[in-house]
């Protein structure tokens, strides 16, 4: 807290302008008068404050608007938004998407903040979904913003918004995250071409059941292993081996390095060693010959 | 502790390129300014560029204008000088320097310990 | 730019006060920071807005700036305060940094 001291002779200001950082705190206090900093906020960017002065600027807003902010004043924050809080920012109503960018530029280069997450949370609260042109600029200041994400949250996103999905946005989106994308990818690309849809869904494809990639499989799609290896487990299993091979194509061979992992290890404890003999890939662990396949699953879902 | 560490100095022929590293740590670097500040041998000091806390504003001494550009990396907590068509009188110790605020070089309250930039041929 | 000029050296008896000017026109509508440096290390900042101190900084070190004068003020002067003393300051117009050329401060 600054002590009140009254301003000195002549240090009045009448704008806003680069004199200011040569005033101390408590000049800034006495000095600079907090209706006339709301109304020329968008000058504070372009002046090369000390965060120690910027906290004296906040103090005056927070005086001037105790309740919150309004959005004129937030929009041209600047600088200033990195000395609020979360606490100060939920009393915020963010309702442009101008703001929001406006912000996220200001903390551009830095990990997301508590502060940032608390305005992304409002401004998408505040706008009900998701929709494309915000999320579009929220994975582009932050890729992995996506992924933050709940299922729950993930599931107010309008498929139309899966246009604005790049790959790198999903690396690390877990199944469950994914379970609730990839519908919404089927759909939002359901009137490409064979080619092109594998293109956008590949991505997406860790939340994909058995049968759409059975589907995948009579398309030449030649499936890559690191895309391989990020699908379900028990979307992978009932997959015979001549579907891995028409979905994996040329990228078969990769199998072999694989072994040991899941969903590969996984599905070769499933395949008869016959079959997988047919790859020539040296794969083990099938299922000898002569061995019954009993598919329990299967027996307890008719019972 | 708060800390800025540069490296990257050494003998440089005219005319020739360098490229220095200040890697910082103790403190949220994205959030500051830096300057790199260089000192010829027994010489005064001397301003010669900073960069803003995200990256998006650049300032350069007329001294150095189109020849020397200033970067940093936040992921890699690290500013970068990268110093071409180098003269003799750019011999000197190049420190980096911490303004405490977002963008600006009104004072500089952390400083690294210097290296040592010689073009001689 | 702004020039700032500084007397190139200043001698001072130990337990003495020691006074380093640095002059730069209307230096006192612009802020004045100081900073000490030791043979072979950084520059340590010891003062800025004209007469604040970091933590840290013994409270002999004192500054003061109006007109088109700086002074940097160290009362009781010690052995260790032997050091080169920079004035610095700030053109906003220019946004340029401006350094003093140094002061060797000499206890005797």
């Known amino acids: 807290e600054v002590e009140k001291t009254a301003c000195p002779s002549g240090k009045k200001a009448r704008e806003i302008d680069e004199s200011l950082i040569f005033y101390k705190k408590w000049e800034l206090e006495a000095c600079v008068d907090a209706a006339l900093l709301a109304t020329q906020m968008d000058r504070v960017n372009a002046i090369p404050f000390t965060y120690e002065q910027l906290d004296v600027l906040k103090h005056k807003l927070d005086e001037l608007y105790p309740q919150g902010y309004p959005e004129s004043v937030i929009q041209h924050l600047g600088y200033l938004f990195l000395k609020m809080s979360p606490e100060d920012i939920r009393k915020w109503n963010v309702t442009s998407l101008e703001t929001l960018k406006a912000l996220l530029e200001v903390n551009k280069g830095h990990e997301m903040s508590p502060q940032v997450a608390t305005l992304i949370d409002r401004f998408v609260k505040g706008r009900g979904q998701l929709d494309k042109d915000t999320l579009d600029t929220l994975t582009a200041f932050y890729p992995g913003y996506l992924c933050s994400l709940s299922p729950e949250e993930l599931s107010s996103v309008p498929p139309s918004s899966i246009w604005a999905v790049r790959p790198q946005d999903l690396d690390t989106c877990d199944p469950r995250q994914l379970d609730v994308l990839y519908p919404k990818a089927r759909l939002a690309f359901q009137n490409m071409n064979g080619s092109e849809y594998f293109v956008k869904i590949q991505s997406f494809l860790g939340g994909a059941p058995t049968e759409d990639l059975k589907a995948l499989s009579q398309q030449n799609v030649s499936m890559d292993l690191a895309t391989f290896m990020k699908l379900r487990t028990d979307a992978v299993l009932p997959l015979t081996v001549a579907e891995v091979q028409k979905l994996l194509g040329p990228h078969v061979e990769g199998l072999k390095a694989e072994e040991r992992h899941r969903p590969v290890r996984d599905w070769i404890l499933r395949q008869r060693q016959d079959d997988l003999d047919t790859l020539g890939l040296g794969l083990q662990g099938g299922i000898p010959n002569g061995y019954l396949v009993l598919d329990l699953s299967m027996q307890e879902a008719l019972s | 502790q708060v800390q800025l560490v540069e490296s990257g100095g050494g003998l440089v022929q005219p005319g020739g390129s360098l490229r220095l590293s200040c890697a910082a740590s103790?403190?949220?670097?994205?959030?500051?300014?830096i300057s790199w500040v260089r000192q010829a041998p027994g010489k005064g000091l001397e301003w010669v560029s900073s960069?803003?806390?995200?990256?998006?504003?650049?300032f350069y001494a007329d001294s150095v204008k189109g020849r020397f550009t200033i970067s940093r990396d936040n992921s890699k907590n690290t500013l970068y000088l990268q110093m071409n068509s180098l003269r003799a009188e750019d011999t000197a110790v190049y420190y980096c320097?911490?303004?405490?605020?977002?963008?600006?070089?009104?004072?500089?309250?952390?400083w690294g310990q210097g290296t040592l930039v010689t073009v001689s041929s | 730019d702004i020039e700032l000029t500084q007397p190139p050296s200043v001698s001072v008896a130990p337990g003495q006060t020691a006074r380093i000017s640095c002059s730069g026109d209307?230096?006192?509508?612009?802020?004045a920071t100081w900073y000490q440096q030791k043979p072979g290390q950084a520059p340590v900042l010891v003062i800025y807005?004209?007469?604040d101190r970091p933590s840290g900084i013994p409270e002999r070190f004192s500054g003061s700036n109006s007109g088109n004068t700086a002074t940097l003020t160290i009362s009781g002067t010690q052995a260790e305060d032997e050091a080169d003393y920079y004035c610095?300051?700030?053109?906003?117009?220019?946004?340029?940094?401006?350094f003093g050329g140094g002061t060797k401060l000499t206890v005797l």
């Open positions: 807005y004209d007469n």
């Open positions: 320097a911490r303004y405490p605020g977002p963008t600006g070089h009104v004072f500089f309250d952390i």
């Open positions: 103790g403190f949220t670097f994205s959030r500051y300014a």
């Open positions: 960069i803003s806390g995200g990256g998006s504003k650049t």
């Open positions: 209307n230096i006192g509508s612009k802020v």
């Open positions: 610095q300051s700030y053109d906003g117009q220019m946004s340029t940094s401006v």
